[in-house]
């Protein structure tokens, strides 16, 4: 279930899967919500002089039990992802950090009157993902009033400094406020040429589509089908950007299919699941656990409740079912993607539905019945 | 459809055949479960026959060649139009059936959940539009529903695609640049249905389109969110109480 | 009642030019695309060109092309047809209709539902 | 252009008769384009059919309108004395629109 509970001055102690610089707890836990293997985190506030370098430290953890040990730290603040917490699962962070440096890559420095205009400017630029304001009362006369654009491999800051008269914070174009606009075509027997930055397998342009929304880096993707002639990248999603945030023109290429990410998208964003259920498909990963159960849908339900999961496989082989049902296996990979997806499977894929905002039952909100 | 594929049985339970008995029975329409009593068409499909009585209601089929004369079928008791539809124009393409006899649901015959209000500003990323309506522009009923999935596209692009209409915010495009997928004749009053936070909405009912499956000529859809206060309205003002609003 | 009153007609000398309005009533203007049909005296019916509701698309016949700008205000209900280079083949009587558009087996329809009176257009010198 | 050929060009008939008027297209035209109108002298058309086979409203249902691809039919079951008049078929399928050149029925 959900857990949003904060335990002050406590770390939890193993299971690390990643570390990274966030301003706040808060930051962080929304980092771990979207981290496809992360469940708990502990995130440093204060620490003693000798360790500066893992001040704001964001350490995010796995379980196999749900839980760590937990250790004193004064300075330290740990929690669970929002994994499962429905409506409170939002990549949108507004806050503002006075006095502190986010830094990453400056790629631009213009002049702006205040913060508001600074976040404006980076909500509208396809590469920045945060940005450092330096006050008029900053020390360095050069940088006073100036906007620092900044982006990074990981999409947060390279290390956090505390620093006067300096304002950061983040992009807004996963608050749908970006003004660059969001075109939402989608271009058959396409591919993009530009510049790869990750790679993931998926079922389907859709699900491309929507992992390089939530990716820091990807501004638009390329998805080859299973029909694709080159076996090794058969329902591969290439997750693409470039120098000036625009593809270069497409390339006609047979059972290819390009897009961009919605990530600049003023309306609502698609959500960050996949609800789909794919038939006679069967995706490939660590076995988690295996329960029987009647249905598709039901076993959809099931590896959304259990944490861990990522996706699962409902299986209709006449081996595979018993009188409860038939075998629903749950399984999980290193990046919340498939491992490899096959066809002609007796049975269907999909996804955990973890990271929906609305995890609950399938009945609908409005209900038209006779008395 | 056009470049679409067969669809299972119980896939799409909310999807009906609305058919008219004249001389012979023909489908003519699509349309949406929306509660016991209730289905949820185009208003168009209703242009020139405006009679209750000659209409047949199926659901609950894969094949229209499963329907024979004993095939149980649905009579209206009631027709909705919208008040502001007009023949002379595109605009208010929708139409309430209330049912003589309340639907028992199975497996293979249930409602579709109705988007709120709010939803008017969601985007959708897993749609489909399903029917027994032409494969091609000159081409014919199909015998097995068809289904295709197919993206949204934004109303003002819409809008440029179809500078002699108005694209208004109470309708809502699909198709894909380069066409080849979309509804066509046949297929008017049926679903368009987008799977959202774990459940399938209606987002659209089948209205319009320029050709069937022609480039940069997306299809045309009534979108169901901006009706939602006339369709209440109409539930709950008949004699049946249809109507229950939960949180979500 | 829709009603559609065409005026601005009148004897022109050739190579002279002319607007016609028709006044629109008793629908909303600004949901239909409208076009201008003439018939010479004696002949039959030719559409000379159409715009959109919104007024961003217009199209002509070739007979009018370069010569002819349909348009409307949709603020006061009226739509116009500017004519210039005027030539004795111009001479007609000029109807505007309002073109309906509606629905029919998931395509739209067209037809011109509703005609004004028409007003004469002459071009002699 | 699509050039819409009507045929045949006069049909002289008394009241009561059957009038079977024929519009032939050099296209293919979707028949939701394709509508039928009667003209009197002095007067302006008026919408019959659309669509092909929909009647317009008041119009009577001795009007009936058939056909679709290239051959379409107007017919009118028994004529009446006011039903005397021109009648164009006319294509808004492609543009250029376009009108027949009417076919004239006259009293016999």
């Known amino acids: 279930g959900c857990m949003t509970q904060l335990y002050k001055n406590t770390f939890f102690r193993g299971g690390d899967l990643a570390a990274i610089y966030t301003p706040d707890a808060q930051y962080c836990q929304k980092m771990c919500t979207f981290h496809p293997r992360c469940l708990l985190f502990s995130f440093l506030a204060v620490t003693p002089p000798k360790e500066t370098n893992k001040r704001f430290g964001c350490f995010m953890k796995e379980s196999i039990t749900g839980t760590l040990p937990r250790i004193h730290r004064t300075g330290a603040i740990s929690g669970h992802s929002l994994k499962q917490c429905g409506h409170q699962i939002s990549a949108c962070h507004r806050d503002i950090y006075k006095g502190l440096d986010m830094r990453g890559s400056n790629f631009n420095i213009s002049k702006t009157d205040n913060i508001e205009e600074c976040q404006k400017l980076c909500t509208n630029n396809f590469h920045c993902q945060f940005f450092t304001y330096a006050t008029s009362a900053f020390y360095r006369p050069e940088y006073r009033k100036k906007c620092l654009l900044k982006h990074s491999a990981s999409g947060t800051p390279t290390s956090i400094k505390s620093a006067d008269n300096l304002v950061s914070g983040f992009s807004l174009k996963s608050c749908a406020l970006s003004e660059i606009g969001c075109p939402m075509d989608i271009f058959q027997h396409s591919a993009f040429a530009d510049l790869n930055v990750s790679q993931v397998i998926t079922p389907d342009a859709f699900v491309c589509r929507t992992i390089c929304t939530f990716h820091p880096n990807c501004l638009f993707f390329t998805f080859y089908t299973n029909e694709w002639e080159t076996e090794s990248q058969r329902n591969v999603c290439f997750l693409k950007t470039s120098k000036s945030g625009r593809p270069s023109p497409p390339i006609p290429q047979e059972n290819a299919i390009s897009g961009y990410s919605l990530l600049t998208c003023r309306k609502t964003r698609p959500e960050p699941c996949h609800s789909k259920i794919y038939s006679g498909v069967d995706f490939e990963g660590e076995e988690l656990n295996v329960t029987f159960v009647q249905g598709a849908d039901v076993c959809q339900e099931t590896c959304t409740k259990t944490i861990r999961c990522q996706f699962f496989i409902y299986s209709l082989l006449p081996q595979d079912c018993k009188e409860e049902g038939c075998k629903c296996s749950l399984r999980l990979s290193t990046d919340g993607s498939p491992t490899r997806i096959t066809y002609g499977m007796q049975g269907s894929s999909g996804y955990s539905l973890r990271l929906c905002k609305l995890v609950d039952s399938p009945d609908c909100t409005t209900k038209i019945n006779a008395r | 459809i056009v470049g679409g594929t067969n669809a299972s049985l119980g896939e799409w339970p909310w999807q009906v055949s609305l058919q008219v008995k004249l001389v012979s029975q023909t489908h003519l329409c699509g349309g949406s479960i929306i509660g016991r009593q209730w289905v949820l068409t185009a208003a168009h499909c209703f242009d020139g026959i405006p009679y209750p009585d000659v209409w047949r209601i199926y659901g609950g089929i894969l094949s229209l060649s499963e329907i024979t004369k004993e095939t149980p079928s649905s009579r209206i008791k009631e027709l909705i139009i919208h008040q502001e539809y007009k023949v002379s124009e595109g605009n208010y393409d929708i139409a309430l059936i209330k049912l003589q006899t309340p639907l028992n649901y199975t497996e293979f015959q249930k409602p579709i959940c109705l988007p709120s209000k709010a939803d008017t500003n969601t985007i959708y990323t897993n749609c489909w539009v399903t029917g027994w309506g032409y494969t091609k522009e000159q081409g014919e009923t199909q015998n097995i529903l068809q289904k295709a999935t197919i993206p949204l596209v934004p109303n003002e692009e819409c809008q440029k695609k179809y500078r002699d209409y108005v694209i208004n915010k109470q309708m809502i495009c699909a198709g894909y640049k380069e066409g080849g997928t979309d509804a066509c004749k046949g297929d008017s009053g049926g679903p368009l249905v987008c799977k959202h936070s774990g459940r399938w909405q209606l987002v659209g009912i089948t209205s319009w389109g320029e050709g069937c499956g022609r480039k940069d000529q997306p299809g045309v859809y009534t979108k169901v969110s901006e009706y939602m206060d006339w369709i209440l309205e109409k539930t709950q003002s008949s004699d049946v109480r249809a109507l229950e609003t939960s949180s979500a | 009642e829709v009603q559609l009153l065409e005026s601005g007609g009148g004897l022109v000398q050739p190579g002279g030019s002319l607007r016609l309005s028709c006044a629109a009533s008793?629908?909303?203007?600004?949901?239909?695309?409208m076009t201008w049909v003439r018939q010479a005296p004696g002949k039959g019916l030719e559409w000379v060109s159409y715009?959109?509701?919104?007024?961003?698309?217009?199209i002509y016949a070739d007979s009018v092309k370069g010569r002819f700008t349909i348009s409307r205000d949709n603020s006061k209900n009226t739509l116009y047809l500017q004519m210039n280079s005027l030539r004795a083949e111009d001479t007609a009587v000029y109807y505007c209709?309002?073109?309906?558009?509606?629905?029919?087996?998931?395509?739209?329809?067209?037809?011109?539902?509703?005609w004004g009176q028409g007003t004469l257009v002459t071009v002699s010198s | 252009e699509i050039v819409l050929t009507q045929s045949p060009g006069t049909l002289s008939l008394s009241p009561g008769e059957r009038a079977t008027l024929s519009c032939r297209t050099s296209?293919?035209?979707?028949?939701?384009?394709l509508a039928w109108y009667q003209q009197k002298p002095g007067q302006a058309p008026r919408l019959l059919i659309y669509?092909?086979?929909s009647r317009a409203t008041g119009i009577p249902d001795r009007f009936s309108g058939s056909g679709s691809g290239t051959d379409f039919t107007l017919t009118i079951s028994r004529l009446e004395p006011e039903d005397f008049a021109v009648y164009y078929c006319?294509?808004?399928?492609?543009?250029?629109?376009?009108f027949g050149q009417g076919t004239k029925v006259e009293i016999k």
């Open positions: 715009i959109s509701p919104s007024g961003g698309h217009t």
């Open positions: 296209q293919f035209v979707n028949s939701n384009y």
């Open positions: 669509g092909a086979s």
């Open positions: 008793g629908f909303t203007f600004s949901h239909y695309l």
């Open positions: 209709a309002r073109v309906a558009r509606g629905i029919a087996a998931r395509s739209r329809t067209s037809y011109f539902d509703y």
């Open positions: 006319q294509q808004s399928s492609r543009t250029p629109w376009t």
